[in-house]
């Protein structure tokens, strides 16, 4: 049902859902700090534009009595319960920030007449694609899938002269929320990734993965997995790996690779790491000082959500337009705004665009190096290192099927 919004007469409120179940195990206090830091910036920007208005956030906390797993498994109803709480209290703001779990976002979108925008730090799954009033500020699974298909098809680079059409996907069910939905998208038989590949098998047991590493009868040389180097080591250890195996390690929200003193462990030599290009600042921010790299991205997405709202509010106020309209609710897409760490671009469906970076380990220096970058906005790959010092034969990525000639 329609809920009256605290969103007029020079006073604009943001409803922030503080859910016990979250995409990342982040203390809610840190998210509050990120939101408050964002509010300070927004107030400054509006004031500089000569707009004398009030912008505040209301934090809506779940009671945590029923939905207390802490991860996303029991989040489906928590979001709806919080919306009911907002509705009963007549405390809906101009915009809803949160939830971050795919289950809860999907259910909230389905079960409510949303005449206000929803901004999510998460909601990675394909089921949250193409939602008219949902904006996602962390790379969703669709973006990963498009990169992988693009990279698989590429065959005209000095270091990749074969198109690939096969893959194993390792998915054992213990993944973090982002990895769960990324791998879920790759596994789905109706997804773009599955449609474009000729062969794809999901490995669910550690032993299956370990056996493939040296199996002469394997159907693909390429294995996709999601997590950090430690996760890979737990699984692979120091086992021997066939020389034409390529492991693609998806680790988007981890900038440990971009620390100056990092040396790649030996077990990473057959691995290409897919991560996001690191931001430029952030390190001195009060909200991010004590956060791990992943959590920094999560808190940053909350902060950028506030900045995005401020950006849209400014545009609508300057144009003398009403905020509590479907036009406002549908406007949070196909735009670039000034984020905390530089410009942030949203695509036609309100999903954040970014630069993904594919790293390899140099056999000469044992350091991570950039092989190529990929711009999700234009779905294009840009090679950076034309003569990489790979572990693979002739410093070229192998064919995805052993013994198959040039494609």
């Amino acid at each position: 049902s329609q809920v009256s919004q605290n969103c007029h007469n020079g006073s604009y409120e943001i409803s922030v859902l503080m859910m016990g179940n979250s995409a990342f195990a982040e203390p809610l206090k840190n998210l509050e700090d990120a939101v408050n830091e964002g509010l300070e910036i927004v107030r400054g920007r509006l004031q500089n534009a000569g707009l004398n208005v009030t912008v505040n956030a209301t934090f809506m906390y779940s009671d945590g009595l029923i939905h207390n797993s802490g991860d996303c498994r029991s989040s489906t109803c928590e979001g709806l319960d919080l919306l009911r709480k907002i509705s009963n209290a007549q405390r809906m703001g101009c915009v809803l920030i949160g939830p971050s779990c795919t289950y809860s976002t999907f259910q909230m979108y389905l079960d409510t007449e949303l005449s206000y925008p929803m901004i999510s730090a998460g909601s990675f799954g394909l089921s949250c694609d193409y939602k008219e009033t949902l904006t996602r500020l962390m790379s969703p699974a669709r973006k990963l899938m498009y990169f992988l298909v693009n990279f698989w098809k590429t065959n005209d680079l000095p270091f990749k002269t074969y198109s690939w059409s096969t893959s194993y996907v390792y998915k054992n069910g213990t993944e973090t929320e982002d990895c769960f939905w990324y791998l879920n998208a790759l596994e789905a038989s109706v997804s773009y990734f599955s449609h474009e590949l000729g062969f794809k098998v999901v490995l669910r047991q550690d032993k299956e993965f370990q056996d493939i590493l040296m199996d002469h009868n394997r159907k693909s040389n390429v294995i996709i997995m999601c997590g950090g180097p430690e996760f890979l080591y737990k699984l692979k250890g120091d086992r021997a790996v066939a020389e034409d195996i390529v492991i693609i390690l998806v680790d988007l929200f981890n900038d440990q690779y971009f620390e100056d003193n990092v040396t790649a462990p030996d077990y990473m030599k057959n691995v290409l790491v897919l991560t996001l290009s690191p931001g430029n600042s952030l390190l001195n921010s009060s909200f991010s000082r004590n956060l791990s790299p992943t959590k920094r991205d999560f808190a940053l997405a909350y902060l950028n959500g506030i900045l995005l709202f401020g950006h849209m509010l400014k545009i609508f106020l300057e144009n003398g337009e009403n905020i509590t309209t479907p036009k406002f609710a549908h406007a949070f897409r196909n735009l670039t705004f000034e984020g905390y760490d530089g410009p942030v671009t949203l695509d036609d469906w309100g999903d954040v665009d970014s630069t993904m970076v594919l790293l390899y380990t140099s056999v000469d220096t044992k350091k991570y190096k950039v092989l190529l970058t990929y711009d999700t906005h234009v779905n294009k790959t840009y090679p950076v290192d034309m003569s990489p010092t790979f572990t693979w034969k002739n410093s070229k990525l192998p064919n995805d099927i052993t013994g198959r000639g040039p494609q």
Partner: nanobody, 123 residues
Framework: EVQLVESGGGLVQPGGSLRLSCAAS????????IGWFRQAPGKEREGVIC???????KYADSVKGRFTISRDNSKNTLYLRMNSLRAEDTAVYYC?????????????????WGQGTMVTVSS
């Protein structure tokens, strides 16, 4: 002796493309952060792209999505691919190198500079 030599400049129509090269000698490009700069007539020199020694490209907003940078260590050469060129891209383009202290950040200043190559975008 450390040397950087740019080539590939010329006259191109708006919307056209060019590829500039920067050949290095006397040192290994791979160990250095490399920047492309440009100076338009009567204007200050400005940074266009930097490639950190770890290989991370960082672009000026004015060229993002149009210019790309790559490195071929076997030829000790850096490339700047410029697409969708505009009249305002007309300038002398310089490449510069810095013995990097950070693998992932652009240096505040560069030690070695090339002589530059002229790019003119005009119909």
């Amino acid at each position: 002796e450390v040397q950087l030599v740019e080539s590939g400049g010329g006259l191109v129509q708006p919307g056209g493309s060019l590829r500039l090269s920067c050949a290095a000698s006397g040192f290994t490009l791979d160990d250095y952060a490399i920047g492309w700069f440009r100076q338009a007539p009567g204007k200050e020199r400005e940074g266009v792209i930097c490639l950190t020694s770890g290989g991370l490209p960082k672009y000026a907003d004015s060229v993002k999505g149009r210019f790309t940078i790559s490195r071929d260590n076997s030829k000790n050469t850096l490339y700047l691919r410029m697409n969708s060129l505009r009249a305002e891209d007309t300038a002398v383009y310089y490449c510069a190198a810095s013995g990097a202290t950070s693998r992932w950040n652009c240096p505040p200043q560069y030690d070695h500079w090339g002589q530059g190559t002229m790019v003119t975008v005009s119909s």
